[in-house]
Interface confidence: low
């Protein structure tokens, strides 16, 4: 059982009250984390509360305001950004969300030398993306869908593509879905370690089927919003990749990175970019039919100043079991020598691990190993290697910290983060300096969360820089709900799950049960962090029983588990929920009269299966902005976990996993189908399709629409969906208003 | 206002080299590139190699390969094509690369090389 | 090497005709096409960059179109010192290529 926050003695309990909507909506109980914006070994920047941009010198204790409030006011900035050295700040202003990732600005150059902005050549607005070199002050920007260069911010722009259009042609920035579902950034560039090199991507979109949907907002003609976005088996866009050498940029064009022959020999996709040095260049590309991803190292040729990537330098990683990689292909990092590098894999037991690899993969040094897996490699020094986990105590759902000392034989590994706090904190992640020579350590749970600073060389805690202390005193009063994270054994499959239980739970007592689910492919629910939020409430104030449950198809506990729903989405996901649901209903406290599922997006598709499984288990259920059918949805995400919607693939799994082919068994569940119209993600098409097949089936449901909302339904939208959300239980549970 | 000035129409025998510059006049080269085009008569350009003086390495083309040299200072471009045939009679052009290498902006008046045997 | 095409090779047309000539890539190369204008004697002079932009300079009755494979150089009204060999030349993939060139003489 995981305790949260301590609880005063019971005589006390009369003034402590249950958690409402309203502290939920208002986000009372939000929490603060302190990641600092590092620009050297030593030294860090964080906005102040008062908004003054502060330098932090860890050595010698010092700070120093380098930007006002008053400067940051002068221009409504609500961003900033330092050049490398430290003569120059953009300030970013106007911020025009476009996309998950993706935003447009103005940007104002203030010349810190002279405590001025900098007039002449100043940056056209809007701006898609914009960015220092790693050393000096250069400036790339994408205006217009065009890459632009400063050698200083007062200079002319250089232009180094013309192609840019609108919907059609990307440079420097990803289209719609590179940004969602492969590079999950707002740009398409990377500078080479001094700055010589940028390097960038052409996404060319011309051949690729538009979504259009319209745009109500309040005039005499509603807008209609077109985004090239291919869905599964459609046309995909053409990525290239060029470098452009920024020192000469007058003389020397965009040269074109080749891509591997076994790639380029069908569809493929670019996945990242990673510099080595100034003049090598690591590329990962990856089949169309995602189970070969190759990662190509390319060096740079003087005499034809070309990039060349020998085939001697190409590394092949391939799944035969499922698709490459977790959610996405794992990027190297790599050692001082500048060719070998660590990454993270399958082994052969099928659990992701570090690898070393010096020459071929096939001759990979396995560097961490065990049944749980390695999660994320966060910094590679001359002797250590960091990196997170779920090892601890076999908890899928934590994260610690460990460090590997690499410079010793034989590697020794050490825990940084296991004993800190035990009973707060069991789910970190890190930040590092340069050279790793300080860290700070960012715990989100399951206790109130603590960001805290460390020595790199000694892990030694130097300060704390942020413990939610105003949190956790407004939390003394509140009567939160107890959680505990358990696991079920059925057939040989694990499953984990986390319940939500009414402060003044009982054993002997019935209880109405609410699924959460979310259950996409390489997701995971059930994780030690901690929370107040809606279902928060319904346990707090309602009386609910909410569970989510971490099935078939999850990440983080091995390749079986994972890959059991390639091809197959829609089935193992949903079983397993009602598997769970059935163990729930054994344990003797769940009133199986009121069970009722809501999910959201993979979740809304999951939810809506389960209401329709016919199994008579659940009452009543929530799909919020649900897929129903994933020739509706986007082809990189969904042809990674089930291939193409084609005859002699697997087009047949595609129909027989629809919401609509189930219509029919909606009849006897409540079902409450909700989506915004304006849904740039999983399209409002996915919910009109279900709608339309119910209504074809005569069958009864509740709907709402949200106007002009996109995926997230932010903003008052949030208030009105949460509120209906809570209406619809509470009717379900029979439960008095 | 920059401008390429090339050196004067030659005639070689068979099997004998040529040198031929072009010289930056009114500023230098100042980071461009220098290409090297010909055109035999009523023949199309064609494009042999080039030179960033910064860098100082040339690239050629393949076709060119081994028979040409191309060199260069701050302000001058040279270009040598040995063991003349008589299908090299052809203008020699010199050329700045504007900002991209091979986008060729400002040209020499040409070279009018003649190889007889 | 990347092989450019053009069509025609030669016309003829008379002062304020439209005149229009197409250039072909074996291969895409995105907008990194240059058209020049040779007058007889004469070294070529650059017209066009990025098949769309006209240098600095250059009259607005020229102008650029297409990408990948196909482009297209058009004079609007021709004039009496336009009678000239125009080249298309690809400057994306080393070697840069020209075209053989199209020849417009006066009708």
């Known amino acids: 059982i995981v305790l949260r926050p301590s609880r005063v003695h019971n005589s006390e309990e009369n003034t402590m009250r249950a958690l409402t909507l309203k502290d939920i909506l208002n986000g009372t109980f939000s929490y603060k984390t302190f990641f600092p914006n590092w620009i050297s070994g030593q030294e860090y920047l964080h906005q102040s509360a008062d908004n003054n941009i502060v330098l932090y010198n860890i050595e010698t204790g010092q700070s120093y305001t380098i930007l006002s409030n008053r400067t940051m006011k002068s221009v409504n900035a609500s961003n900033y950004g330092l050049s490398p050295d430290r003569q120059f700040v953009y300030l970013e202003s106007d911020y025009s969300k476009l996309w998950r990732y993706s935003y447009t600005a103005t940007y104002y150059i203030y010349d810190l030398s002279n405590g001025e902005f900098v007039r002449g050549n100043e940056l056209p607005r809007p701006i898609q993306y914009l960015c220092w070199s790693p050393v000096g002050s250069k400036l790339a920007y994408v205006y217009q869908n065009n890459i632009y260069l400063k050698q200083r911010p007062g200079d002319p722009p250089f232009q180094i593509t013309f192609n840019g259009r609108e919907n059609k042609i990307f440079n420097g920035i990803p289209d719609w879905v590179y940004e969602e579902e492969m590079l999950a950034t707002k740009y398409a560039l990377w500078w080479s370690p001094n700055g010589k090199f940028l390097a960038y991507a052409e996404f060319n979109d011309t051949d690729i089927p538009v979504i259009a949907y319209s745009y109500y907002g309040d005039e005499q003609y509603p807008r209609t919003i077109n985004i090239p976005y291919p869905k599964a088996g459609a046309k995909n866009p053409v990525v290239r990749i060029f470098i452009i050498d920024t020192t000469y940029p007058a003389y020397v064009g965009p040269q074109e990175v080749p891509v591997p022959a076994m790639i380029a020999s069908s569809d493929y996709y670019f996945s990242w970019l990673t510099w080595v040095t100034d003049e090598r260049v690591c590329l990962q590309w990856l089949k169309r039919v995602q189970n070969v991803s190759v990662l190509s190292i390319c060096d740079f040729r003087e005499d034809w100043q070309t990039w060349d990537c020998p085939k001697t330098q190409e590394h092949i990683e391939e799944s035969r079991t499922g698709w490459a990689g977790g959610f996405f292909v794992s990027t190297p990092v790599f050692s001082y020598d500048a060719i070998s590098y660590y990454k993270i894999f399958s082994d052969k037991d099928g659990y992701k691990h570090i690898h070393y690899i010096k020459d071929t993969v096939e001759n990979a040094i396995q560097i961490t190993s065990g049944k749980w897996e390695a999660i994320n490699i966060f910094r590679v020094t001359q002797d250590s290697l960091f990196y997170s986990s779920n090892e601890f105590e076999e908890y899928p759902g934590r994260r610690n910290i460990y460090r590997i000392s690499i410079g010793s034989y034989p590697p020794s590994k050490k825990c940084v983060t296991c004993h800190l706090r035990k009973e707060r904190c069991q789910y970190y992640t890190a930040s590092f300096s340069d050279y790793a020579k300080y860290y700070a350590l960012v715990c989100y749970g399951p206790g109130i969360p603590i960001s805290t600073l460390h020595d790199g060389r000694t892990d030694q805690e130097i300060k704390i820089l942020e413990e939610n202390k105003e949190l956790e005193n407004a939390l003394k009063n509140i009567q939160l709900p107890k959680e505990e994270i358990k696991k079920l054994e059925v057939d040989e499959i694990t499953l984990w799950y986390k319940m939500i239980l009414p402060p003044q739970f009982d054993r002997s007592k019935k209880y109405p049960l609410l699924i959460q689910v979310y259950g996409g492919p390489c997701s995971q629910s059930v994780r030690s962090v901690f929370a107040v939020n809606w279902i928060s409430y319904l346990a707090s104030k309602e009386g609910m029983v909410i569970a989510l449950v971490d099935g078939r198809g999850t990440a983080f506990q091995g390749d079986k588990l994972l890959y059991a729903v390639y091809r197959k989405l829609g089935v193992y996901e949903v079983e397993d929920q009602i598997t769970a649901v059935r163990k729930f209903i054994e344990m003797g406290f769940i009133d199986e009269k009121r069970i009722a599922i809501w999910g959201w997006s993979y979740g809304g598709y999951v939810s809506s299966l389960a209401l329709a499984s016919g199994t008579g288990l659940f009452k009543c259920g929530i799909a919020v902005a649900p897929v129903s059918s994933w020739e509706y949805y986007a082809s990189v995400y969904t042809e990674r976990f089930m291939g193409l919607p084609t005859k002699d693939d697997n087009l047949e799994h595609y129909k027989n996993s629809t919401v609509m082919a189930r219509a029919e068994y909606f009849r006897n569940v409540d079902y409450l189908l909700i989506h915004g119209t304006a849904d740039d993600n999983v399209h409002f098409q996915n919910s009109a399709q279900i709608a339309k097949a119910l209504v074809n089936a005569q069958v009864d449901f509740q709907a709402m629409w949200y106007s002009d909302q996109n995926h997230g339904l932010s903003g008052l939208s949030t208030n009105h969906l949460y509120t209906h959300m809570t209406h619809f239980l509470k009717q379900c549970f029979s439960l008095s208003d | 206002q920059v401008q390429l000035v090339q050196s004067g129409a030659e005639v070689k025998k068979d099997g004998a080299s040529v040198k031929v510059s072009c010289k930056a006049t009114?500023?230098?080269?100042?980071?461009?590139?220098i290409s090297w085009v010909r055109q035999a008569p009523g023949q199309r350009l064609e494009w042999m190699g080039e030179?960033?003086?910064?860098?100082?390495t040339p690239n050629y083309a393949q076709s060119f390969q081994g028979r040409v040299t191309i060199t260069a200072d701050e302000s001058t471009s040279y270009m040598e094509v040995s063991s003349l045939r008589s299908e090299d009679t052809a203008t020699y052009y010199c050329?700045?690369?504007?900002?991209?290498?091979?986008?060729?902006?400002?040209w020499g008046q040409g070279t009018l090389v003649t190889v007889s045997s | 090497d990347i092989q450019m095409t053009q069509s025609p090779s030669s016309l003829s047309a008379s002062t304020g005709d439209r005149v229009t000539i197409t250039c072909r890539a074996s291969?895409?190369?995105?907008?990194?096409l240059a058209w020049y204008q040779q007058a007889p004697g004469k070294a070529p002079h650059l017209l066009m960059s990025?098949?769309?932009t006209l240098q600095t300079g250059v009259p607005s009755r020229f102008s650029g179109s297409g990408s990948g494979t196909d482009f297209t150089l058009t004079i609007t009204s021709l004039q009496s010192e336009d009678f000239a060999t125009y080249y298309c030349?690809?400057?994306?993939?080393?070697?840069?290529?020209f075209g053989q060139g199209t020849r417009v003489e006066i009708k």
């Open positions: 030349q690809q400057y994306y993939i080393y070697p840069p290529t």
């Open positions: 291969q895409d190369i995105s907008s990194y």
């Open positions: 990025g098949a769309t």
């Open positions: 009114g500023g230098t080269f100042s980071g461009h590139a």
């Open positions: 030179i960033s003086p910064m860098f100082g």
């Open positions: 050329a700045r690369g504007a900002n991209y290498r091979a986008l060729l902006d400002y």
